[in-house]
Every structure is written in C-alpha cells, then in structure tokens.
C-alpha cells in the first residue's frame, strides 16, 4: 500500500454520545488537518473512506452500513448514528484518497450511558452567567444538522433529575432556557432533551451543561491590593528573613488574565543578584472572584536589600495598579515594645514571622505584636 | 439532623382530594429535592413524583400525571403533594423523601409517613 | 416501565447467617440501583446506591453487587436489627420503580 499522511490518533477530539441516541460525527480532517474542505475534495475526485477499530482490540476493520435500518451511515464528510449502541465505542478512522494522494487521521469515540437523572461520565461544557445581571439564556447545544429545519422538535428542559417548568427565575423557551435574573442557588447542571421525528421513527438529543454563575461586568473593579498597604512597615535586621505578602482581590471578568508581580528596585526579581524566591497561591469565591498572593521571601536579608524598593503590581482587564512595601532596618532600641495579642484577619501567620511593626495612627510608637491563635 | 415531619392521617371520601405536608428541617430544603412514594397496605413501594423547592422543577410518574400536583414554600421549607379524584386503591402510607442532592434518584431521609384512607 | 422482580420474597434465617436477596430488572438498568430496608411501622431506609455503593452510617455487613439486569444485596452476618422488608429501586429509567420487596424473618 502507498504512502498515506497519518495524522495519527486525534485525542484533542475525544468524542462522547450518548447510548441510545442519534450521533453525528465529521470527519476532523477537514475542520483541523487539511487546508481544503469535503468539497472541493469531492470534486477534486477524492474519496472518504471509514474504518475502526473496537474497544480493546487491534484490529481495524471496515463500517459495516448495511445494518437494518441504515443504523449507520456516511453523508458527505459526516459519519451518523441512528442511534448509537454502547460497543460502538472504538477508534474510528477518516481517510480521504485518490490513486495518487492519501491523508489519515484516527480520533476516540466513547458511547457513554446516562440515568433518569442524566448523570454520566460525560464531560460537560461550563456556561457562566453573570450574578443579578437581567435576562440571560442558555442554548441546547450540539443540535445543528440533526433534522431539518422544517422539523419541529419538542424540547424539554430539566435541572438535576426534575423538569423546569415556568417557576421562579427560570423559564424554558424552546431550545433556550432564560435566567430572569441568576443567583448562586442557579449553580448545577442543565439539560435540555431535544425529541424529533425521522422516517416514523423518534429520536432523542440529550445535552446537558453546567451553569456556573460569576461576577457581574457591572460590580467589576481594577485590581484591589490589600498588601502590602500603608499600614505595615517591614522592620527587619540583617541576617532575618523577610517575607512580603502582596495579596491581589480580582473582580471576575470573563477571559481576562490577572497577572501579580514583584519588582524589586524597578526590575523583576530574576534580573537581581539576590536570592529571592516567590511563592503565588490562588484563591476563588462562588462567584469566582479571584484573590492572588504572592508571597516575596528573602531567606538572609542585607542592609542593601533593607534599602531596595519592593513593588507588587498587580493587572487585569480593568487596568493596573502597583503598591510599594515599607521596609527598614530595624533600629537597636525602640522607645518601648508592647507584647500584645489582636488578630489581623488572614495573614496571622506571616504577621507573627515577621514580627512586624505597626505605626499607629500618626504617632511614633511602635509595637511589636505576637499573634496567638 | 435532618428531620422531614409530615402531617396527620386523613380519611377522604371517593372522588375528593387530600394534601399532605412535609415540613424540613436542619436547613436541608436548599439545593435538595424531595419525591413523594407512597405504599398500599401489605404491598410495595411506587414512586410518585418529586420537586427542587428552589426551581419549582418538578417530574410526575405517568401514572399520576394530571392527578398529583406536587408544589413546595421555600419560605417554609415545607413540601406539598395534593392527590385529586381519590378513589379506593388509593388508600396508602404516603411518605416524602429527600434526595441526597437534585441529581441524585435515591432517598436518603425519610419522611415517618401519612395514612390516607379514601373510605364511602 | 422497567419491572424489578425481588427472590425470594421471604428468607428465613438464623442470626449470624448470612443472607443473600436477589433483584432483576426487566431490562439493563448499569449500575442504576439502590437497597433499602423497611421495618413495620417505619419508613424505609437507604442502605444503598450505585448497586455497590454504601450510604453514611450503613454498617459493613451490608454489600451490594451486580449490573444489567442482576443484582444481589448480601448481609454477610445477621444481626437482631437487621430482620425487616429490603426492596431494590432502579433510577435508570422513569418512571423510578422499586422491587415488591423480600421479607428476611428469623429461621
């Protein structure tokens, strides 16, 4: 046999149906691997050939179309279902050929099976919806080229395992399901189950996705930095750590990167030759507002590095923000030290590391706090 | 502990309806749904229908459809399930059950249970 | 709808035995099942999901198996409490269904 362009097995496609029901499958060469589509292929005199290979074997073996009642069947670049059963499951192949020109590509389809409650191993796509935003909706994804458009589907939405029928904030309207107005409590999954006749036969499309509500453009603000902040000076001796949280509040915005970092005299901290290592947790609320903390430790600080400048910026679609931290070289004798107790919210635990000093409104006291907890 | 505590036993005559209550508490009505099974004297369980308090969202069994309405106050986080057109083999413990979550079809709280009695 | 036949719809065993239920659906259900125990005068009691699974506090003698269409609650050593009505449920399909139930009474 000739040579033949094998693109391999496509794993960025991993294909999941649903047993039982209608699947139609295109031939991911000409979305992702050729520059030409079915087409001018077709008219350019190529074929499109269809194999597979079974679940757990090694064989690969031709698509069996002459199963009753056109069970399976090929459509210009289309490979269809009606319905799908649960060994279906296998590697399927596309190739597209002439006497003189060959090209491949193998991509994993999965039957997978649901309950009443349409739970399954299916990866569900995630829709976010904007908290207290005004009318939203979603779409029954995946229907398009199922039936005709003279074909006029029943479509019935559930939440969980229970019908939405008009209630509350939520109101099926066909293939779309309106959010009056989205709260937390609309968190979960949705599924749409679409019904349509074909050649006296009914067929079902299951399609559920998960609704994720998130913070609204309306309440969106640039970058918040609690700190490093006016209130707390880094006081630290020669040979002492130091350790500088810069803590980040991110409103959610869609598809917007919030980014944090240290600059340390104007430069990233990789271009100084001090030993510097940074350490970043993120954190998100349920409306996936995002909190970034970097935190900047120097194991063995100098008097030179008491003296450098060290911002944290901070930056997001909304726009950029930069808050410089107060460090010092600790003075021998302080007027007087207070041992004291007193929380500080989250950062206790650095807090008491530190030992940090705390200016009191104005004044020139300085007080040492340890932190219980 | 959660606790789902329904309303007294009721005699009804042939041809009425009946409402039963199921009142939650421990704050489970939240992100739960709740069916109603009822059971014959001597004889099995059968599945109703149920509802997510928070959504309104509810499914029947076919059997009940157009005679069972099932509904529920968040305010109150109590359940009703209203059986009209009673007739005699309808005369059964009627029981609530909470899922363990809207996506789950198994029971895991029980309510103790409402005799209905539909007696001429 | 899918029909679940329980066998045998009494057992009659001597404490410390073990005890083993059938349930068979009509048609596959997966792993779409759950047990409960009934005693008279209560309300039943989850003792299982996903046809294996064991809900919160269920002690361990207490085990389900199977898929499709044949299942098999098995309590490895009976205890007092355990004598009572065990009925299988499938949520595999609507409407849910439920099994009429096996009476496990002491031999």
């Known amino acids: 046999s000739e040579r033949c362009d094998d693109w391999g097995l496509d794993t960025m496609r991993q294909i999941q149906v649903f047993e039982d029901e209608p699947a139609r499958i295109k031939c991911p060469l000409f979305e992702h691997f050729l520059k030409f589509n079915y087409s001018t292929a077709h008219s350019a005199g190529l074929t499109l050939i269809w194999y597979w290979t079974r679940q757990d074997r090694d064989l690969e073996e031709p698509i069996n179309f002459r199963l009753p009642e056109n069970r399976i069947s090929k459509e210009k670049d289309v490979l269809w279902f009606r319905p799908t059963l649960l060994n279906d499951t296998g590697n399927y192949t596309c190739m597209l050929r002439n006497t003189t020109y060959c090209s491949k590509v193998a991509f994993p389809l999965e039957v997978v099976q649901k309950d009443s409650c349409f739970n399954s191993p299916m990866k569900l796509p995630v829709h976010k919806l904007y908290i207290e935003y005004g009318i939203q909706r979603i779409t029954c994804p995946n229907v398009d080229g199922y039936f005709p458009s003279s074909v006029k589907p029943t479509i019935t939405w559930y939440m969980g395992c229970y019908k939405i029928q008009n209630f509350n904030n939520v109101i099926p309207e066909g293939m779309n399901l309106s959010f009056l107005i989205a709260f937390i409590s609309n968190n979960g999954n949705y599924t749409c189950v679409v019904t349509y006749p074909e050649n006296g036969r009914t067929f079902h499309l299951t399609r559920t996705l998960t609704v994720k509500v998130v913070g609204s453009p309306k309440n969106a603000v640039p970058p918040v930095i609690h700190s490093p902040n006016d209130h707390v000076v880094y006081e630290k001796e020669p040979g002492e750590e130091l350790l500088i949280p810069c803590t980040v509040y991110f409103s959610f915005l869609m598809d917007s990167r919030n980014e944090v970092w240290w600059t340390i005299d104007g430069k990233k901290p990789d271009d100084i030759p001090i030993d510097v290592t940074i350490n970043e947790s993120i954190s998100h609320s349920r409306t996936e507002d995002e909190t970034r903390t970097q935190i900047l430790s120097i194991k063995k600080v100098t008097s030179e590095d008491l003296k450098r400048s060290y911002v944290c910026h901070a930056r997001s679609a909304k726009g950029e923000v930069a808050k410089a931290a107060t460090v010092k070289q600790k003075v021998p004798a302080p007027r007087y030290t207070v041992e004291g107790g007193g929380g500080t919210g989250g950062l206790n635990d650095i807090f008491e590391a530190q030992k940090i000093e705390w200016h009191e409104g104005g004044g020139h006291h300085h007080h040492h706090h340890h932190h219980h907890h | 502990q959660v606790q789902l505590v329904q309303s007294g036993a009721e005699v009804k005559k042939p041809g009425s309806s009946v409402k039963v209550s199921c009142k939650a508490s421990?704050?489970?009505?939240?992100?739960?749904?709740i069916s109603w099974v009822r059971q014959a004297p001597g004889q099995g369980l059968e599945w109703m229908g149920g509802?997510?308090?928070?959504?309104?969202?509810?499914n029947y069994a076919q059997k009940f459809q157009g005679r069972v309405t099932i509904t529920a106050d968040e305010s109150t986080s109590t359940a009703y399930m209203e059986l009209s057109s009673l007739r005699s083999e309808d005369t059964a413990v009627y029981y609530c059950?909470?899922?363990?979550?809207?996506?789950?079809?198994?029971?895991?709280?029980w309510g103790q249970g409402t005799l209905v009695t539909v007696s001429s | 709808e899918i029909v679940m036949t329980q066998s045998p719809a009494t057992l009659s065993v001597s404490p410390g035995e073990r005890a083993t239920l059938s349930c068979r659906a009509s048609q596959s259900v997966s792993s779409n099942l759950a047990w409960y125990q009934q005693k008279p005068g209560q309300a039943p009691r989850l003792l299982i999901y996903?046809?294996?699974t064991r809900a919160t506090g269920i002690p361990a003698r207490f085990s389900g198996s199977g898929s499709g269409t044949e299942f098999t609650l098995t309590i490895s050593s009976l205890q007092s409490e355990d004598f009572a009505v065990y009925y299988c449920?499938?949520?595999?399909?609507?409407?849910?269904?439920f099994g009429q139930g096996t009476k496990v009474e002491i031999k």
């Open positions: 421990g704050g489970v009505f939240s992100g739960y749904a």
């Open positions: 449920q499938q949520y595999n399909n609507w409407p849910w269904t």
């Open positions: 509802i997510i308090p928070e959504f309104g969202a509810t």
């Open positions: 996903g046809a294996s």
């Open positions: 059950a909470r899922h363990s979550s809207a996506y789950s079809p198994w029971f895991d709280y």
